[in-house]
């Protein structure tokens, strides 16, 4: 599997999409896991609803949500309030029995919030009647890793 890079801005939401063949994976629940080390296990973060027919319902674990469009064949993971420690290698998985097939390998990169580096005088603050509460900001840039790029730092 090639690794796809998704970049998000710290403090904002990042949406990761994993396309798959909807017939090939019909009836199978999905999961999002975090790779522990280059050859380590993939630790489950969140999985879709226990009933496959309800996979469209968003399930949360902490700040991570998962939802599955089983007809269109797209698994979507949302990482809310992205933090530097969220950076790393993940997998979208299709579950069958107690095994899992990898749908996509994902490298999450967290970019610094550009607002953090400005002088306070340059910042715009919302007035009392204005708020970011209703705004749903999702920033997602994705690319595939170039040949030879390594998602983990080399280990000695």
């Amino acid at each position: 599997h090639n690794t796809t890079v998704f970049q998000g801005v710290a403090g904002q939401s990042l949406q990761v999409s994993c396309p798959y063949d909807s017939m090939k994976h019909w009836g199978r629940r999905k999961a999002w896991c975090r790779q522990l080390g280059e050859k380590g296990p993939c630790q489950r973060v969140v999985s879709t609803h226990n009933l496959w027919l309800l996979s469209f319902l968003r399930r949360w674990n902490g700040s991570t949500a998962i939802t599955d469009d089983t007809l269109g064949g797209t698994l979507t993971i949302t990482l809310r309030n992205l933090q530097p420690h969220d950076a790393g290698l993940y997998q979208c998985q299709s579950l069958h029995g107690s095994e899992a097939d990898t749908l996509r390998k994902v490298l999450v990169e967290v970019l610094a919030d550009p607002l953090d580096h400005r002088d306070a005088g340059d910042l715009w603050f919302p007035g009392e009647s204005e708020s970011f509460e209703d705004a749903h900001v999702e920033h997602s840039i994705s690319r595939s890793l170039l040949e030879g790029e390594i998602p983990f730092p080399p280990t000695s």
Epitope: M23, K24, W26, G27, W52, L53, L95, G97, S98, E99
Partner: antibody, heavy 123, light 107 residues
Framework: EVQLVQSGAEVKKPGESLKISCKGS????????IAWVRQMPGKGLEWMGI????????RYSPSFQGQVTISADKSISTAYLQWSSLKASDTAMYFC????????????????WGQGTLVTVSS | DIQMTQSPSSVSASVGDRVTITCRAS??????LAWYQQKPGKAPKLLIY???SRQNGVPSRFSGSGSGTDFTLTISSLQPEDFATYFC?????????FGQGTKLEIK
Amino acid sequence: EVQLVQSGAEVKKPGESLKISCKGSGSSFTSYWIAWVRQMPGKGLEWMGIIYPGDGDTRYSPSFQGQVTISADKSISTAYLQWSSLKASDTAMYFCARSRTFYYDSSDYFDYWGQGTLVTVSS
Amino acid sequence: DIQMTQSPSSVSASVGDRVTITCRASQGISSWLAWYQQKPGKAPKLLIYAASSRQNGVPSRFSGSGSGTDFTLTISSLQPEDFATYFCQQADRFPRTFGQGTKLEIK
């Protein structure tokens, strides 16, 4: 109705090659995984491997990896099991079976089977 | 590989009898287990999947139970057409593995 129709019985000599087939009825053939199962004379069932005809994704049992090749031609809704060099111990009945995932279980079971192909390898 | 062990290997019973066949997995397989019936010269037929769900068209006298490592197939009242060989199969991990079979014979 779903049907899996297998090719006829074969009698071969050791060292010969062979390719047997399993033809599915209906356009849904490419939407299901197809497994191959061996049954030696008077013995139990052995899962050999499985293929998704839609893209050719294949998994083998370690016991059969390198011994056989599983393939499929989705344009004619047919899965294949082949040997490059048969042995007397390959004498068995070979079944293909459709692997169906049941949505409230998220695992797969063999709900439709072919009639079987008897392969006899003898000098 | 997960080993599946059936018992007994064969059983003799009469029409109307209640028969129980057991299947034990070498490791936990949750409820990912199927039961098949095979008659001589024929392909196996799926009876039970997910340990206890009856396949469409299978008579209600067939029932399955169990989870983890121990499973049972029960035929509540044997009919003449039930005399056959029964196999369990785990659907938890690749490679899929079957039990060695239980032959149900007429007493």
